[in-house]
Amino acid sequence: TIPPHVQKSVNNDMIVTDNNGAVKFPQLCKFCDVRFSTCDNQKSCMSNCSITSICEKPQEVCVAVWRKNDENITLETVCHDPKLPYHDFILEDAASPKCIMKEKKKPGETFFMCSCSSDECNDNIIFSEEYNTSNPDLLLVIFQ
């Protein structure tokens, strides 16, 4: 628990506790917001983001968003609360230890997004089909 000498505060989303009152450590994520990227037609890419930030709220996970349009390719890396949509999409894979890209429907661009919950997991973004969650080995990793 938060020890007695640490004040309790009302309506506090900076602290996440389990049923026993244990405190959750926050996630460490790559956090460069939106940057131009050279990642294209690859099974996986590194983010090339040099900033690893402490997520503001312990419930937040790491997110990466890859977008391609007629003009450029961008990669966005952030922390985000999986209970809230991001770019109008639910973070379905927030419990995954790896950031496995899933395509989302967005008019006028190709849009992939992934989320994950191990330290700096949005540094390595995976597009390859072999990592798809239909793979039973990956499901074992995620739910162990």
Partner: nanobody
Framework: EVQLLESGGGLVQPGGSLRLSCAAS???????RMWWVRQAPGKGLEWVS?????????YYARSVDGRFTISRDNSKNTLYLQMNSLRAEDTAVYYC?????????????????WGQGTLVTVSS
């Protein structure tokens, strides 16, 4: 017995600097990621900075990045936080905390994971 003892807090003017220390004992310091966590009056905990046990890789909250510097001296079992360009919103009690590799939750012990804290007041 595990102990974490913070010191170095005090009253400082906006734009000023302070250096906090956390003396650790009763555990193998070099096995733990160490954190600085703060709590402003009436607010929740804010995770300010962390440093890896070996290699001194560091992490910061966006609110302090570029102003605060975390460091550790493993030979002295001591954690530090150099705070520069202090602002009124940095006023808080600052705690050090320890985290084992891969540990997601902080267990239910008053002194195993937290120090008593040191008060930093930024005011003119």
């Amino acid at each position: 017995e595990v102990q974490l003892l913070e010191s170095g807090g005090g009253l400082v003017q906006p734009g000023g600097s302070l250096r906090l220390s956390c003396a650790a004992s009763g555990f193998t310091f070099t096995e733990y990621r160490m954190w600085w966590v703060r709590q402003a009056p009436g607010k929740g905990l804010e995770w300010v900075s962390a440093i890896e046990p070996i290699g001194n890789r560091t992490y910061y909250a966006r609110s302090v990045d570029g102003r605060f510097t975390i460091s550790r001296d493993n030979s002295k079992n001591t954690l530090y936080l150099q705070m520069n360009s202090l602002r009124a919103e940095d006023t808080a009690v600052y705690y050090c905390a320890k985290q084992m590799p891969g540990q997601k939750w902080m267990a239910k012990s008053r002194f195993d994971y937290w120090g008593q804290g040191t008060l930093v007041t930024v005011s003119s």
